[in-house]
Structures are given as C-alpha cells and as structure tokens.
C-alpha cells in the first residue's frame, strides 16, 4: 500500500491524543534506554509503511501486537485517513481472525514497540533531517 495520500495531520492528531499513550502503557516498566532504535524512516509515507509493517506483520518472537490497543487504533486511523487502505485490510482481517495468536508480552515485543515509538516520533517531525 502507498501511504502518500494519507491525511497526515489527522493521523498525527490521533497519535498524539491516544496512540502514543497506549504505546507508553505497553512499555510501562521498561527503561527508555533499554533498546536501541534500529529501524528508521525518511518521510511520512515511509514512516507509515514501517509502522504498518512492525505493528501488523508477525515477527520471530513477537506474533501478537495486532491485538493490542495501540494497534487497533493505528489500524482505525489508517482505515479512516488513508484513501483505499480499508479495502486492503478485508482479506487481512479474515486471516488475522483465523490466526488468533494469544496476547503475550515478550522481550522481543517490547523491543518492537520501542522501535514503533521511534518511528511515530519521526513521523511527527517530518522536517527533521535524517541522522
């Protein structure tokens, strides 16, 4: 999916008002210095591509993020403010229902959510030069 035509300001507002808080809740009890940010993004569409991938694609050691509250809210924001995104999710939703992975917070998941926090922060500061 190409995130170029999303309403970035409305997605940013949703992140600042609610998604960011859910990410913090998920990471509670973890030191902010515990994980290094290894995933980066260069502009807003690229950031959303990386955010979608890390949030919804199961990875080795972390298969369950899609059921978390921040993930549900991310999915809603993309469906509402990214033209045509919802139709790409029809089949994905069916597949996710079949998988039904249990919610398990592993260290790998915490690391992944830490990366997500970094990607979202970068999404909110699109004019900053890449380090």
């Amino acid at each position: 999916y190409d995130f170029t035509n999303c309403d970035f300001e409305k997605i940013k507002a949703a992140y600042l008002s609610t998604i960011s808080k859910d990410l913090i809740t998920y990471m509670s009890g973890t030191k902010s210095t515990e994980f290094n940010n290894t995933v980066s993004c260069s502009n807003r569409p690229h950031c959303l591509t990386e955010i979608q991938s890390l949030t919804f694609n199961p990875t080795a050691g972390c298969a369950s993020l899609a059921k978390e509250m921040f993930a549900m809210k991310t999915k809603a924001a993309l469906a509402i403010w990214c033209p045509g995104y919802s139709e790409t999710q029809i089949n994905a939703t069916q597949a996710m229902k079949k998988r039904r992975a249990a919610k398990v917070t592993t260290n790998k998941c915490l690391e992944q959510v830490s990366q997500l926090q970094g990607l979202w922060r970068r999404f909110n500061r699109p004019l900053l030069k890449q380090q």
Partner: antibody
Framework: QVQLVQSGAEVKKPGASVKVSCKAS????????MHWVRQAPGQGLEWMGT????????DYNQNFKGRVTMTTDTSTSTAYMELRSLRSDDTAVYYC?????????????WGQGTLVTVSS | EIVLTQSPGTLSLSPGERATLSCRAS??????VHWYQQKPGQAPRLLIK???QSISGIPDRFSGSGSGTDFTLTISRLEPEDFAVYYC?????????FGQGTKVEIK
C-alpha cells in the same frame, strides 16, 4: 441483534439548534465509528460526518464545518449529532449508521431516521 | 471530493426482468463501492459491499461487479419487493459520497 434507535422528530425555527441522539445496542460500541447521513425530502443521501469512539475524534463534511458537532457517550453507547444555525434547507431526515473501523469498513446498520423540520 | 454518477435515473421494468444499474466514479477508487436499497419511509439497507461482496441475509439475485471507475449492480430477476431506489456509495476517501440514486419502478 444490532440496533440503532434514534430520538424523535423535531420542529425548529431558523437560527436554532437541534441535537439528535442515536442509542446503539447489540455490539461493542467502540469497535465502530458512528456516521451521520441526511436526506432532504425527495432527495438523495448526503454524508455529514463521523465520530470515532476508539480514537475519540471526529471528521466532518466541509459543507457542515463550523455548524455540526458529533459526540458519543461510551458509557451509554449513545451518539449525538448537533446542528446549529438551522436554515429551512436543513429540513431532512437524519440517519445514524455504524461502520467498522478495524474490520467490516461499511455502513451495515442504520437508525430509523429522525425528521427535523425547520420552519418559521 | 469524489463524485458518483448513477445511471439511469429511473428504470422501468416488470417483475421477473433483469435490472442493470450503473455507478461511475470521477476518479479511480479501486473496489471501495457499496450498494444500498431504500424504500419509502425506510432507512437504506446494505446490499453489496466492496463492489462485489455479498451480504448475509441479502437474496443472491443481487450481485455487484466493477473496479476502478465503473461499477454495476445487477438484480437477476426482479421480485415485487425489489422496486425501490438504489444508491452507490464510495468509502475510498473522505468525504464519503453517494450517487444520486436510481429508481427502479414497475413498468
């Protein structure tokens, strides 16, 4: 089963405001956005806007910007649509309709409609 | 804003006949089109979602097709209860919009 029950008909004077309610039951309220669609007598359907409880935010049709406010009360699973500075051409049936925001993505259940008449 | 244009405005047919309703979008919207039926004094009822996907409880004489800019709702054999107004809607991008409607009336 899923039900959306709207408040009763209203008669208002030009310049006044109206607040229509829509009580939902039979599903998880926060899994769906609540959209508002109106239909003037003998006319087609016009999307007014939506409130998304999951994100606690709204998005409105520019045609109504500044005149409309959509809210929800999640404790009672009720959505509200307030339209201000009413004009005679706001006379219409106002519908609420739910739409999934993490699945479904379509207006699959509608309220029965609320007739708002604006007349001096 | 995406404009949906429905044709014809009115379709006069007899029970048992086939009805073909058209909906054209002002720009490509992939398959983000849904079809609704509305009878006098009633709320719209969802018939088809995402251009061609059937809805539970809707008779299989209703079918949809199309993608991009051109979409079609087909009623294979009209029943007396099918005479109503039909609307297409796009949810590709905000603001969501509806076509102006096609009235299917008894000939």
């Amino acid at each position: 089963q899923v039900q959306l029950v709207q408040s009763g008909a209203e008669v208002k004077k030009p310049g006044a405001s109206v607040k229509v309610s829509c009580k939902a039951s039979g599903y998880i309220f926060t899994d769906y956005a609540m959209h508002w669609v109106r239909q003037a007598p003998g006319q087609g359907l016009e999307w007014m806007g939506t409130f998304i409880p999951l994100l606690d935010t709204s998005d409105y049709n520019q045609n109504f910007k500044g005149r409309v406010t959509m809210t929800t009360d999640t404790s009672t699973s009720t959505a509200y649509m307030e339209l201000r500075s009413l004009r005679s051409d706001d006379t219409a049936v106002y519908y609420c309709a739910r739409m999934g925001v993490t699945h479904s993505y379509v207006m699959d259940a509608w309220g029965q409609g609320t007739l708002v008449t604006v007349s001096s | 804003e995406i404009v949906l244009t429905q044709s014809p405005g009115t379709l006069s047919l007899s029970p048992g006949e086939r009805a073909t309703l058209s909906c054209r979008a002002s720009q490509p919207i992939s398959i983000s089109v849904h079809w609704y039926q509305q009878k006098p004094g009633q709320a719209p009822r969802l018939l088809i979602k995402f251009a061609s996907q059937s809805i539970s409880g809707i008779p299989d004489r209703f079918s949809g097709s199309g993608s991009g800019t051109d979409f079609t709702l087909t009623i294979s054999r009209l029943e007396p209860e099918d005479f109503a107004v039909y609307y297409c809607q796009q949810t590709f991008s905000l603001p969501y919009t509806f076509g102006q409607g096609t009235k299917v009336e008894i000939k």
